[in-house]
């Protein structure tokens, strides 16, 4: 299907940290389409090449993913069809951090949103009762 | 402010070899890819080279393959691309830019001339 | 390689004219398009990419549009100091191939 540029839907992101070694989830989600074929999710990290993930036509398409991310990324494939394009990032690493964009095509438009990624070696506030 | 600055251009000969260097501020510059585009005088722009971030990945035009390689120092800001077995229509001054998402380029350098003549 | 092919090669316009300039992919790019304007002895400017998003300082009288192989660059009020050389470039696999520019001249 084709997209012009007149069309645009909401995309938004939330601003999220994560912890170097472990897995880090990278928020994000837009107004849902009838059918998962006409969803396009796109993330892209700003100064990197290539795609950090792909997900078209109800399956992740991982051709043009850069070098840094193989292997690594994910999206939450059941919850695409109600709008979430939450990408999962397994064992995260202090390069991740950065800006991130959300992009997102669906039969209606398209539309993107960016979120800042912070990796850091974070610990839990412990708590005394 | 981001900033770029490239150097060593000059007057070459045909076959002849040249490195040129891209140095890089204001930006963490190991997150970035980078890229060197060319004018020939009087000509539209033509992509050369690119390289990722890390430097493990590295691209070329047709016309520059196995001639040309792209490099970069991190630790030292630095964005080269070696310039062998030079010919007349490699006359240009050469770009570098920064990618900004995918391979769109935001900023470039002020540029500098390559003259291979004999 | 991917083929960009830019029309009309060049211009002649007014201050306040709405400006159209076309930039056809030989092969599906998707929206990975981006503009640049380049003025005499001067590097380019990056406008816009992902063919209608505006490079943050850019004016608003500049938008981008379409997707897979056709794409448009549109100047809505030509302004004084937008008389430069536009180029197209596709940014979705190497090499990233450049349009061969469009020169606006002044009327």
């Known amino acids: 299907f084709g997209i012009s540029g007149r069309h645009s839907i909401t995309v938004t992101t939330v601003a999220s940290a994560g912890n170097i070694g472990e897995d880090g989830i990278l928020s994000c989600t837009f107004e849902p389409d009838i059918k998962l074929s006409d969803i396009v999710i796109q993330w892209l990290k700003e100064g990197v090449l290539g795609l950090v993930h792909e997900f078209k036509e109800g399956k992740d398409e991982l051709s043009e993913q850069d070098e840094m991310f193989r292997g690594r990324t994910a999206v939450f494939a059941d919850q695409v069809i109600v709008g979430n394009a939450s990408l999962r990032l397994k064992n995260v690493q202090l390069t991740d951090a950065g800006t991130y964009k959300c992009y997102i095509i669906t039969s209606k438009g398209k539309g993107n949103a960016n979120l800042e990624y912070k990796t850091g070696a974070f610990s839990m506030p412990e708590v005394n009762v | 402010e981001v900033q770029l600055l490239e150097s060593g251009g000059g007057l070459v000969q045909p076959g002849g070899s040249l490195r040129l260097s891209c140095a890089a501020s204001g930006f963490t510059f190991s997150s970035y890819g980078m890229h060197w585009v060319r004018q020939a005088p009087g000509k539209g722009l033509e992509w050369v080279s690119g390289?990722?971030?890390?430097?493990?990945?590295?691209y070329y035009a047709d016309s520059v393959k196995g001639r040309f390689t792209i490099s970069r120092d991190n630790s030292k800001n630095t964005l080269y691309l070696q310039m062998n077995s030079l010919r007349a229509e490699d006359t240009a001054v050469y770009y570098c830019?920064?990618?900004?998402?995918?391979?769109?380029?935001?900023?470039w350098g002020q540029g500098t001339l390559v003259n291979v003549s004999s | 390689d991917i083929q960009m092919t830019q029309s009309p090669s060049s211009l002649s316009a007014s201050v306040g004219d709405r400006v159209t300039i076309t930039c056809r992919a030989s092969q599906d790019i998707s929206y990975w398009l981006a503009w640049y304007q380049q003025k005499p002895g001067k590097a380019p400017k990056l406008l816009i990419y992902?063919?209608?998003t505006l490079q943050s300082g850019v004016p608003s009288r500049f938008s981008g549009s379409g997707s897979g192989t056709d794409f448009t660059l549109t100047i809505s009020s030509l302004q004084p100091e937008d008389f430069a050389t536009y180029y197209c470039?596709?940014?979705?696999?190497?090499?990233?191939?450049f349009g061969q520019g469009t020169k606006v001249e002044i009327k």
């Open positions: 390289i990722s971030g890390s430097g493990g990945s590295t």
């Open positions: 830019a920064r990618t900004q998402w995918r391979a769109s380029l935001d900023p």
């Open positions: 992902g063919a209608s």
């Open positions: 470039q596709q940014t979705t696999m190497s090499p990233y191939t």
